[in-house]
């Protein structure tokens, strides 16, 4: 079975962890394919490690474990994605998790940012 | 770096048979699945048979199941196609195909001509 | 089997010009999607994988777009070195199937 929040919540700008975790007494995960709505973002496959796709490679970075890390996040990245995990003999499980990115506090709340100068 | 070469490829009579042998370097064999793949004279790529590297799962295209075998040996890191009750349709030069994560196919040998005639 | 339709079948073009093939599957293929390169008496050469993302090597101006079952190969400003024939084909289930293939030519 496949474990995963369903839905988390990310600032624009920031970064999130895409996390789906595969529990079985009988089947070992061969490759792990995680997707933003049907584009790729990432592979993993234990014969060949990490690849990730050329389109989200300054953006993703494989891991923690077989999760992945977005970072640089739009508004345009909420929505879902789907981890599938491969295994043998068990056949194909799949996850899916919403992302929700959100205006960081700094824009909501409106406030400028200043840089104060420590005294010396 | 990566390289394929095929081999075994010829003029072949009608219900004869025919080995190729793909002989693949610069990488490690035994982590792809391979693939064969070939092209008619003058006409487009039609997929043959694939082995996958981790399970060593096959499968066939239903033109060639029951007469072509696919094989591998990790050990010498060469990809088999056992071609048996050959037909003319077949001609074809035949490629061997390195496939990473069963999804594209990166790499592909210079192919080798088979000719099924009488 | 998913069929893959590929058009136009063949094209003519000049050098600089913008040029669109299109590939559309039989049923949904999510993003299980390649192009391919290939010139006479040559293997073919992998130019999009995963319907969007460029190999490495490939010139930035070949781009793939496209998802479920229309998609589109585009090459920007087409070069002397781009006139060729140019596949399509899906990895989402075997049998793996390719589409007839687009010939660029020179106009």
């Known amino acids: 079975t496949i474990d995963t929040k369903r839905n988390i919540s990310a600032e624009e700008g920031g970064s999130v962890i895409l996390q789906c975790h595969f529990s079985s007494d009988t089947a070992e995960v061969t490759q792990v394919d995680w997707k933003q709505q049907d584009q790729l973002l990432a592979i993993y496959s234990v014969d060949l490690g990490w690849h990730v796709a050329s389109v989200f490679s300054d953006r993703v970075v494989p891991g923690p474990s077989l999760g992945l890390t977005f970072q640089s996040l739009t508004m345009n990245d909420t929505g879902e994605y789907f981890c599938t995990y491969h295994t043998y003999p068990g056949g194909i499980y799949k996850g899916r998790i919403f992302l929700k990115v959100q205006e960081s506090s700094d824009d909501r709340n409106g406030l400028a940012q200043f840089q104060t100068a420590p005294l010396g | 770096e990566v390289q394929l070469l095929e081999s075994g490829g010829g003029l072949v009579q009608p219900g004869g048979s025919l080995r190729l042998s793909c002989a693949a370097s610069g990488f490690t064999f035994s982590s792809y699945s391979m693939h064969w793949v070939r092209q008619a004279p003058g006409k487009g790529l039609e997929w043959v048979a694939s082995i996958k590297g981790n399970t060593g799962s096959i499968s066939y295209a239903d033109s060639v199941k029951g007469r072509f075998t696919i094989s591998r040996d990790n050990s010498k890191n060469t990809l088999y196609l056992q071609m048996n009750s050959l037909r003319a349709e077949d001609t074809a030069v035949y490629y061997c195909?390195?496939?990473?994560?069963?999804?594209?196919?990166?790499?592909w040998g210079q192919g080798t001509l088979v000719t099924v005639s009488s | 089997d998913i069929q893959m339709t590929q058009s136009p079948s063949s094209l003519s073009a000049s050098v600089g010009d913008r040029v669109t093939i299109t590939c559309r599957a039989s049923?949904?293929?999510?993003?299980?999607l390649n192009w391919y390169q290939q010139k006479p008496g040559k293997a073919p050469k992998l130019l999009i994988y995963a319907a969007s993302s460029l190999q490495s090597g490939v010139p930035s101006r070949f781009s793939g777009s496209g998802s479920g079952t229309d998609f589109t190969l585009t090459i920007s400003s087409l070069q002397p070195e781009d006139f060729a024939t140019y596949y399509c084909?899906?990895?989402?289930?075997?049998?793996?199937?390719f589409g007839g293939g687009t010939k660029v030519e020179i106009k």
């Open positions: 195909a390195r496939v990473p994560y069963d999804y594209w196919i990166d790499y």
């Open positions: 049923q949904s293929i999510s993003s299980y």
């Open positions: 084909q899906q990895s989402y289930s075997t049998p793996l199937t």
